[in-house]
Structures are given as C-alpha cells and as structure tokens.
Interface confidence: low
C-alpha cells in the first residue's frame, strides 16, 4: 500500500469579506483507518476548524461526503469570511487509536488572506501641451488592493515602455495598497493618435488586467509648417497668393497676412484639412494688387498656432511692367 | 523581442484550400492592424490581404472571394484562409505588422512557402 | 490602383558609393511611403515610413525623401551589407502596391 500523502494543492487563497472561501485537501490513501481534522495554526494552541465526527461548525460544509467509505475528498467551505478568519489551515489526518484518536500526519497548509481588488488605474499627463522629441511624464494610480504584490506595466501603441518608475504603499503591514506609477515618454510626431496604456495586473484578477488610458492628443502640440506661393496665373492687377498651413495640432490657429509689412488681413482657421496622422493643414488664400507703380511687394503669412509664439513665412513679389502671369520663389 | 511566425505552408493541388497561420509575440497583439504579403519565386512583393484591430478586411481583386483574413487576439495569431487555390498564388507569404498608427509594415515573420501544382 | 514605378531596375555600384533610387506614385499618396531592403531568402526589413521617418535601429546612412508622388531613397555611403533589392510601398489607400523593386549589385 503506497504511503498516504496529504495534499493541499493552494499555498495560498485569497479570499474577499463576505464571500465563501474553499480549502481543498486530498489524500492518496485511505490507510490508516482514522478520521480528518481541520486547524487553523499549529503547536498546542491551534484552533479546530472542523471535525466530522463532534463538535457544531455553522459555517463550515463539506465538499464531498465523508460518511462513504472509499471518500478522499476532505474539502471543506467556510461562509461569510470574515478579517477574523485569515491564517494558515491544515488539514490532519488522525489514526485510530484507544482511548484517543493519534495525529498521524498533516498537510503542507493553505494560508487564508483576505483579498481586494484593485481600482481601475486612473493615468493622468501633464498639464501643458509639449512639441514631438521632447519627453513628457504620464502617472497611473491604483488603489485598495491586497496583497501587496502587483505587476504594473506602461504601453505606448501596444509597444512596452522601460521608462518609468513605481512604488507601492505603505512598506509595511496595512489591510490595502496603493501603487503610483510615472512613465516618461518621448513624443513622436504622429502621435497626435496615440495611446499610453498603463496596465495593472493581481492575483485577485484571475489573469485579466486592469488598464487606464490617456491620449498623447491631450500632451502634444504639433508645430505648423509654412509654405507661401504666388499662383501662376494673374487677373488683371491682382495676384493670387496661398499661405499652406500643414500638419499641425491641436485646431487653434489664427493667421495673419501683411503687405510690406502692413496688416491687411486676418483670419481664424477653420474647415481644416485632417491628415491620415490625426494634424491638420489648412490654405488661406490673399488677392494682392499690383499697379505699375509698385516696384517690390513682400507679403508675409503670419501664423500663432495655440497660444504660441507666432511664426512667419515672406514672399517677395517682383513686379514689373513686362511681368507675365510668373509666380515667386519663397523666402525664409 | 517582437516577432512573427508563419506555418501552415505547403504543396496542395489547383483548386484546393490551405489555411496559413502567423504567430505573434513581444507587443501587445489586439493593438495592432496586420498584413499578409506573398512574393512569388524571383519576383517582386504583393500585398495580399489586411485585417485592422476592428476586425475589418481588405483584399486586392486578385484574391478577393477566394482568400479570407481573420485574427485570434486571445492567442495572439493571424490567419489566412485560401480556398480555390491557382498556380499563381505559388510564392513565400509572409506576416507583417502594421506600425504604430502610420500602419507601415514594420515588423515581417520569415515566411512560409505556398506550392499549387497537380 | 495606384502603380508604384522605381528606377533604376537594376544598379551597379561600389563600396563607399553614394546612392539614389527613385519611386514615382501614378497619383498623389500624401507621403504613405515606405522602403524596404530584401536579401536572397530573407524577409524585407522596414527602413523608411511616411517617406522619410527612419524606422528603429535603421542606421543614419539611409535617408528618404520626396513628397506627392516622387520620392526617394539615398545610401550616403554604401557597405558590403548594403547590396540587396530594395521596395518601395504605398500605404495610403488600399490596394497597398509595392515598386517592382531595384536590384543593387557590387560593381
């Protein structure tokens, strides 16, 4: 006959107030003849958890039934857990014995500890708005979660970030935990439609994360390029001219035109233009007149993009007499 | 480290299916549109099939009623169903990656070859 | 769909060479271009996306220009490692179409 083991397959279960926790304990044999006992503890001062044969147990059930001759099944479940309840249980096998029942062997013990689910992580960026290839500082928080072990990881776009630093609090001994994370993150120019994940992982999760998220739209701010051209064709005395505002984030632009360095004209952008990367372009278009008489026009297109320091792009018309219908190379 | 693996490769006759598999790890899969490009022996790329993370598809008329796309987020894998199979769909077809947004082909298994032939 | 024209087919050169390939776009692809390098039994490597970001842990000496329709790969100074057969691709609209690829050989 093979030697009896005694097996509780969970070193630990984490379990929540309330809720009905399960202790599972096998054996390989049904030899020696005796019953099992459940304690809470070990040495002298263990507390009897269950015995099938005396004693009253209101919260305590069987998982299988103990009365058939051929059981190896001594699980028990115990009802409306309580803080009260936590500690280690072993499951103890007895042989029969005159007058008293002796202690023959015990399994290796489950400790019971009350378990708290995580909050949903909640990740917060900063405050102003900040142009690609500059690092920006994304925080996650956790709260009320027990045990203190936790996984805390940040993603951009799917892809796993290394740069970033977490603690969890307190040191020491509490009921519940916090973890705050703070990520740094190098901004890309198309990441107007990008997304910072951070993603918390616990036991007390069964394997399915929890995950906060923040959109690099709300950091990032995209710096407008200009481009000022003359049209080639001419109506009269009048030039078409066209300011091309591209690729730029957030909406907020204003623009303003000036002849030889006189303003004459001003304009909030609008019906944008949105590029398959989530910035915007936009054209405004200025009819500049031309008489004989005016040997040098040099317009300038203007553009102060989210409350920013403006920025300005010169076009300098040569006009002649004999000019015909030529457009102008642009100057920085 | 992020890589792609295709199976499923082999010699089946003109008018047979064979289903093709890719399998994804070191990125968060589900986050991600992914590619099927095929080229055959000595010749130039193709762009065979494409299932963003939605779940939407895209074939190019060569391939459209016969090929079907479909992915298993939970098992981080890429699927590629080709029925009523011609000798010109012969080549090496490879997974690929779609990048971050810009849906660039950044990352590409190493292959698996797909023989139609009686 | 939009056809992807390179040139030149096929380019002999030599160690420390700078060279240019060139991909034309049949109608305007708003810079959804990308490049590729393939070496026999291989499969092609990203280099260049949105036709001059240079993809992670591609060295500085490729480089990608051009915008609308034209566009263009350069290798400042080419290395043994370098001659292979190079792609380029649309991904702006779907059918996504590569170039028919151009071999660069050792001269």
């Known amino acids: 006959e093979e030697e009896l083991q005694m097996i509780q397959p969970e070193k630990l279960l984490l379990v929540t107030v309330g809720k009905t926790a399960t202790l599972h304990c096998t054996v390989t044999s049904l030899l020696p003849v005796g019953p099992v006992l459940w304690f809470r503890g070990v040495g002298p001062g263990r507390e009897l958890i269950y015995n099938q044969k005396e004693g009253h147990f209101p919260r305590v059930t069987t998982v299988s039934d103990l009365t058939k001759r051929n059981n190896m099944d001594f699980s028990i479940r115990i009802s409306s857990i309580t803080p009260a309840d936590v500690g280690t249980y072993y499951c103890v096998k007895f042989r029969k014995g005159s007058p008293d029942d002796v202690e023959f062997k015990s399994g290796p013990g489950t400790e019971m500890a009350l378990g708290a689910k995580p909050s949903a992580p909640v990740v917060l960026g900063p405050a102003a708005r900040t142009t690609p290839e500059h690092t920006v500082s994304f925080t996650c928080e956790s709260h009320g979660f027990s045990p203190r072990d936790i996984t805390l990881k940040w993603f951009k776009n799917g892809n796993e970030l290394s740069d970033f630093q977490t603690n969890v609090d307190p040191t020491g001994q509490s009921v519940a935990y916090s973890i705050r994370s703070t990520a740094r993150v190098v901004l890309d120019p198309w990441d107007v439609r990008s997304q910072v994940i951070c993603e918390v992982a616990h036991v007390t999760l069964q394997g399915d994360p929890l995950r906060g998220t923040a959109n690099l739209s709300e950091a990032i701010r995209v710096p407008p390029t200009l481009e000022v051209t003359q049209q080639p064709m001419r109506v009269g005395n009048q030039v078409n001219v066209t300011c091309q505002v591209r690729k730029f984030y957030p909406q907020s632009l204003q623009l303003t035109w000036s002849e030889n360095g006189n303003v004459c004209q001003r304009e909030t952008a609008s019906t944008l233009t949105e590029n398959k990367d989530g910035t915007y372009n936009w054209t405004s278009w200025f009819l500049v007149n031309i008489s004989d008489q005016r040997d040098d026009v040099v317009l300038t297109c203007q553009v102060k993009h989210d409350g920013q320091l403006a920025v300005s792009k010169r076009l300098a018309l040569e006009v002649t007499v004999h000019q015909k219908d030529q457009s102008s190379d642009a100057t920085p | 480290e992020v890589q792609l693996v295709e199976s499923g490769g082999g010699l089946v006759q003109p008018g047979g299916s064979l289903r093709l598999s890719c399998a994804a790890s070191?990125?968060?899969?589900?986050?991600?549109?992914m590619h099927w490009v095929r080229q055959p022996t000595g010749k130039g790329l193709e762009w065979v099939s494409t299932?963003?993370?939605?779940?939407?598809?895209y074939f190019p008329g060569s391939v459209k009623g016969r090929f079907t796309i479909s992915r298993e987020n939970a098992k981080n894998s890429l699927y590629l169903q080709m029925n009523s199979l011609r000798a010109g769909d012969t080549a090496v077809y490879y997974c690929a990656r779609g990048g971050n947004w810009d849906d660039a082909l950044d990352i590409w298994g190493q292959g698996t070859m797909v023989t139609v032939s009686s | 769909d939009i056809q992807m024209t390179q040139s030149p087919s096929s380019l002999s050169a030599s160690v420390g060479d700078r060279v240019t390939i060139t991909c034309r776009a049949s109608?305007?692809?708003?810079?959804?271009l990308a490049w590729f390098q393939q070496k026999p039994g291989k499969a092609p490597k990203s280099l260049i996306y949105t036709a001059s970001s240079l993809q992670s842990g591609v060295p500085s000496k490729f480089s990608g220009s051009g915008s609308g329709t034209d566009f263009t790969l350069t290798i400042s100074s080419l290395q043994p490692e370098d001659f292979a057969t190079y792609y380029c691709?649309?991904?702006?609209?779907?059918?996504?179409?590569f170039g028919q690829g151009t071999k660069l050989e050792i001269k």
């Open positions: 109608q305007d692809i708003n810079n959804y």
């Open positions: 070191g990125f968060t899969f589900s986050s991600f549109d």
């Open positions: 299932i963003g993370i939605a779940g939407d598809t």
């Open positions: 691709q649309q991904y702006n609209t779907y059918p996504y179409t």
